[in-house]
Structures are given as C-alpha cells and as structure tokens.
Amino acid sequence: REPTIQCGSETGPSPEWMVQHTLTPGDLRDLQVELVKTSVAAEEFSILMNISWILRADASIRLLKATKICVSGKNNMNSYSCVRCNYTEAFQSQTRPSGGKWTFSYVGFPVELSTLYLISAHNIPNANMNEDSPSLSVNFTSPGCLNHVMKYKKQCTEAGSLWDPDITACKKNEKMVEVNFTTNPLGNRYTILIQRDTTLGFSRVLENKLMRTSVAIPVTEESEGAVVQLTPYLHTCGNDCIRREGTVVLCSETSAPIPPDDNRRMLGG
C-alpha cells in the first residue's frame, strides 16, 4: 500500500528528539504554500493554508516516520502552532509507482489578512540534540481582501470584497472625465478621486438605486492614464471599505453617453 499521512497537533518537541538516532532521513526537497477556501457553514468560509512538501528521492526516506510543520504568524497578534503528519506506511520506493517524487499536503492553519507567516518543516526522526537539524522554511504573506480566495472572508465581504463595480473611466475632453460604475447594494455613498501625482478631480456620489451610474467629473489637467479611485461607504464597513481603482482612457465615439441632467451627479469638484 502507498503511504498516506495522518496529521494532528503537536505543540512541544517531538518525542524522537529525546532519543539518539544513528541515522536520520534527509531533509525535504521542496515546501510550498497556497490558500484554500473551505466552507464552514452556509455563507461562512474559512481560509486555510494548503501546505505541500516533496520528499527527497533517496533511500533515506526508508527511515522517515513523520514530517512536522510549524507556522508562526506576525502581525498585531503573534501566533505559533505545529502539526505532526505521520506516514501510515514505510516507503517501499524512492518515487511514486506512477512516477515523480512523493508529495504530500496538509490543509490547516487559519489565515488572517495581510499577515507574514513563516512556515517551517522537518522530517522525523530529526537530527540528534546537538546536531544541525535539516529543515526547510518558506515565508508567506497572506494577501488582502481583493485576493480571489481571501475575498470570501467575512470581514472582506463586509468591506465589499464581492462587489464588482466594473469601473470604466474615459476622458471626454480636456476638462471632463466620465466615470461609470455599478453601485453596491450595501451602501449609497461613494467618493471618486482622479489622481496622477496630485488629485486632478474629485466627486462625491449619492446613489440609492442598484444600477450602473455615470458621473461627470471636472479635472484640472491632462487626465488620460490617470488613476480613478472609487471608495464606497457601506453599512458594514463605514470608512474602512475596500477602495477600487480604474484608469482613465480616451472616450471612444461609442462610449456610453452621460445621462441627462436629472441623473447626472456633479457633486464636489
């Protein structure tokens, strides 16, 4: 039978560390981390690390009992936890029967937003107490709310991560930029900035209806290539909502027309 892994928490040192070993398995060949979204309950998602590792293809894997993975996180709250993954069978070959290295993965360790994590892994039995223990480490910085996985976190959805404003912005003339976006059902207030090195134009928008809105914004100088920053003010995140960006391009003849005056928003300036 092919080896699989059974993983569980191991907070302290591994018991094998207390025992003298004449021979120990080699180090890991590779260690990688990616994010996965797992359903916790209806509409509830947890973002976890998917940690995968590759074993070195030589006879030393015959001694391999387990691999221990530890994760430390550094942001406003430091965290540290370890998991030990035991191999269910002894290795009968240095590569998988179908070809390629032995590769295993563990899904666990909840991930916070924009946090630096150090993930380290070593094989067990590891080197003796006074010897160098071969281990492999990788740094991983978790992304923010606009990441395709992180956007499902509750604090991200509340900050508007699932909203797609589909911003388009085009230069109508030297003095005017037209910005189109889809409003958010969770709020009705927005600010729009047009920036290069400085702010070229600014507008506040109030829009209750869930619709595609068009705003004409006066600008003070050349706007083509400038960045459009759209900030929503939603019930769930107040002033801490996720900002969205677009770029000003030249309006084409087929651009959506600026709506008539009763729909046009030109607040601020």
């Epitope: 004449t22 293809a57 030589d58 006879a59 030393s60 015959r62 070959s93 240095q94 390629g100 290295k101």
Partner: antibody, heavy 118, light 107 residues
Framework: QVQLVQSGAEVKKPGASVKVSCKAS????????MNWVRQAPGQGLEWMGR????????QYNQKFKDRVTMTRDTSISTAYMELSRLRSDDTAVYYC???????????WGQGTLVTVSS | DIQMTQSPSSLSASVGDRVTITCRAS??????LAWYQQKPGKAPKLLLY???NLADGVPSRFSGSGSGTDYTLTISSLQPEDFATYYC?????????FGGGTKVEIK
Amino acid sequence: QVQLVQSGAEVKKPGASVKVSCKASGYTFISYWMNWVRQAPGQGLEWMGRIDPYDSEIQYNQKFKDRVTMTRDTSISTAYMELSRLRSDDTAVYYCARSGGFDWFAYWGQGTLVTVSS
Amino acid sequence: DIQMTQSPSSLSASVGDRVTITCRASENINSNLAWYQQKPGKAPKLLLYDVTNLADGVPSRFSGSGSGTDYTLTISSLQPEDFATYYCQHFWGPPYTFGGGTKVEIK
C-alpha cells in the same frame, strides 16, 4: 521485458564532446530514475549521476559536474548523457542503468565504448 | 562520499567451493547495499539488493548478509558460470559508489 538499448561506439578527439543515448522499453519510462555509470578499461565501476525522467531532476557526481549534462525525451523514452571537454582518461564503456525501488541498478544497457584519442 | 572497500581483490576457487566476498562501507549505510556480477565484455548484472534480496532469476546459491558497515556475499557452491568479477554498491543517497571489485578465477 525491460530493455535499455544504447547508441553505438564513438571515437573522439581530446577536447571534443560525446553524447550517448539510452532508449528504454518494457516499462513506464517516467517511473524510475536513470543512472549513468562508466567503466574504464580494466577498472571498476564509477557512478556519474542520475536523472528523474518525470521532472528532469538531476544529481551529478561532483567529479563530473562541470562536464556532464543529462537530459531525457519522454516522448521517445530516451535518456541522454553528454560529456564535454573529453580527455584520454575518459576512454571507457558508458552504461545507462535503471534504478529499482531505490537506487540499486536493476537493468543495464549494453554499454557504449567511447574512445578518446588524438 | 562513502567509500566502499571490497576484499579480496581476487581469489582462486574450484567448482563446488564456498566463496565469501566482503565489502566494508566507510560509514553506516543502513543495509542499502547491492551486489553485481560482471563477465568480460558484458554489462554488470544485479544479484542482490537490500543485502539479502535476490534479484529476479538469480540462483539461490547466492546469498548476502551484514548490517551497518560490514557486508558479505556468499556463493554456497561455486558453479562454472560463476567465474566473474563481483562488485558491491551502496545506495544510501547520492553519490553512489562501488567497491573495487573481486575477481573470482578458476583454481
């Protein structure tokens, strides 16, 4: 049945390069490492390195690291060993040898005699 | 690198004799040892791996023993086709090395 068939004998001048091929059949080529071993006339066996046909990972004997290149073509189940900057003491029979479950050499090619002479 | 020292380098024996060849590793190779037989002008042939396991088609008169650093190949009753050179090889992680060989000749 497993077979490893190597390319024919070569005569090369010092400083030249030689490329030996090893065509595998009778098993799944990507499932086992391929090793290269050489034997100078009247001498013992010397491991040169190995390649994993699955992903082309290579491990060389440090002695040959700067002069040897191992490659493979999975579409034709063939491994290659190229030795550059040949010297007269590179005159030897070069064998490809397939690993077993671990790196015992369960199957061998017939050998390729490379003669380096000016 | 692990050195493999084989002894004797050559021996003379008669058909029916019991022959023993030893191989010593410069460090513990954890029984990751193979034995090969090579005849003139031919590729080596695997005899045993993991010290004691007979390769396919190898007669049971060949056996292996040992652990740690010291290993032995025994031919219980030498046959005419057994006159050849024998090599040990460790596979306890690259680089793999062979013993210098033992040539078994007819007395």
